[in-house]
């Protein structure tokens, strides 16, 4: 099935980083400066991916694969293959229409992306705050008052909380 | 594909509860967050609280604080929703949504949505 | 917390331009995300950010914000958009609250 298929079209001979070039008779050229293919048997090459202002080169354009871009310091990558580049916060902080703005009182957010999200009411869980929340921290909860009565055993503190942010990609 | 899929409907008495689940696929079950919003019949949209599967954590509206559990089993990618002292205005469809999220621009947006849950309180 | 308000109902032309509007003081400080919910279905996004698009909603959903004002427009309206819209953001407690929805009718 290859051989006839090869027989019936040249173009499917010509390896990645090749095209197959109609005006030289479909012979199998190389792609030019700044163009690649990542298949064989294509009939042009892409264009590389170019990465200016706030993106940087992290894996330079080869004739078999294209350029991949990250984000140049103070910025985070958004999107399938880091097609755009987003303002980093400072902890404490989130993105908002006007920029980076101090998490609210009441909020908090311990990573430089993501967005501010309320302290755990230690109370729905029958605790009590152990550890005041800031604007970069959780609050940390720890035993119910009853437990802290004289007699009670001494605390072990609690691990610590897992804050909200997302998982790191 | 991306699915959030949950719990058939539910009929209770007043003054029970109910347990509602979401079990999600098609993703890194840690990597985003599930909130749960509800529809009364003919209403809109009302938000009941958020979870973080990954760790735990919790946040829940006003409305609903001692009322509301979100919890979650990570073994089976599953979140729940349990809602006690049921009341006949708690009669709606309950869904679960999934916070855009992941490597996405946090725009505070429900990008996938469960089918819902009917759960009808009526003595 | 916060509230967000939407008319209750807006009608248009079959092909014509209709803006939902979504007000709220929250809206100074987060954008607003927009939900398409026809009878029977679960709510759909259908614009998030200021004018972001996900996939597979129509380049006719548009996005603008203005001050505590987000909108959501409809370039040449389709019989297949008429729907209830649903605003959403957060408030600056961490909370999200929904506006009460625009029932939208095409004409």
């Known amino acids: 099935f290859e051989r006839t298929r090869s027989l019936q079209d040249p173009c499917s001979n010509c390896p990645a980083g090749t095209f197959c070039d109609n005006n030289r008779n479909q012979i199998c050229s190389p792609c030019p400066p700044n163009s690649f293919s990542s298949a064989g048997g294509q009939r042009t090459c892409d264009i590389c991916r170019q990465c200016k202002g706030v993106f940087r080169t992290r894996k330079e354009c080869s004739s078999t694969s294209n350029a991949e871009c990250d984000c140049t310091p103070g910025f985070h990558c958004l999107g399938a293959g880091c097609s755009m580049c987003e303002q980093d916060c400072k902890q404490g902080q989130e993105l908002t229409k006007k920029g980076c703005k101090d998490c609210c009182f009441g909020t908090f957010n311990d990573q430089k992306r993501g967005i501010c999200r309320p302290w755990t009411n230690c109370s729905l869980d029958g605790k009590s705050v152990l550890v005041n929340g800031t604007k970069e921290r959780d609050v940390v909860c720890g035993p119910s008052p009853a437990d802290l009565s004289p007699g009670a055993s001494s605390v072990t503190p609690p691990a610590p909380a897992r804050e909200p942010g997302h998982s790191p990609q | 594909q991306v699915q959030l899929v949950q719990s058939g409907a539910e009929v209770k008495k007043p003054g029970a509860s109910v347990k509602v689940s979401c079990k999600t696929s098609g993703y890194n079950f840690n990597t985003y967050y599930i909130h749960w919003v509800r529809q009364a019949p003919g209403q809109g949209l009302e938000w009941m609280g958020i979870i973080n599967p990954s760790g735990g954590y919790t946040s829940y509206a006003q409305n609903f604080q001692g009322r509301v559990t979100m919890t979650r089993d990570t073994s089976t990618s599953t979140v729940y929703m349990e809602l006690s002292s049921l009341r006949s205005e708690d009669t709606a469809l309950y869904y679960c949504?999934?916070?855009?999220?992941?490597?996405?621009?946090?725009?505070?947006?429900?990008?996938?949505w469960g089918q819902g849950t009917m759960v009808t309180v009526s003595s | 917390s916060s509230e967000l308000t939407q008319d209750p109902a807006v009608s248009v032309a079959l092909g014509q331009t209709v803006r939902i509007t979504c007000q709220g003081d929250?809206?100074?400080?987060?954008?607003a995300s927009w939900y398409q919910q026809k009878p029977g279905q679960a709510p759909l996004l259908v614009m998030f950010?200021?004018?972001k698009r996900p996939s597979g909603i129509p380049d006719r959903f548009s996005g603008s914000s203005s001050g505590n004002t987000a909108s959501l427009t409809i370039t040449g309206a389709q019989a297949e958009d008429e729907a209830d819209y649903y605003c959403n953001s957060r408030d600056t407690s961490g909370s999200w609250v929904f506006g009460g929805g625009t029932k939208l009718t095409v004409l």
């Open positions: 949504a999934r916070e855009l999220g992941g490597n996405v621009r946090r725009d505070d947006a429900f990008d996938i």
């Open positions: 929250s809206l100074r400080r987060y954008y």
């Open positions: 950010g200021e004018d």
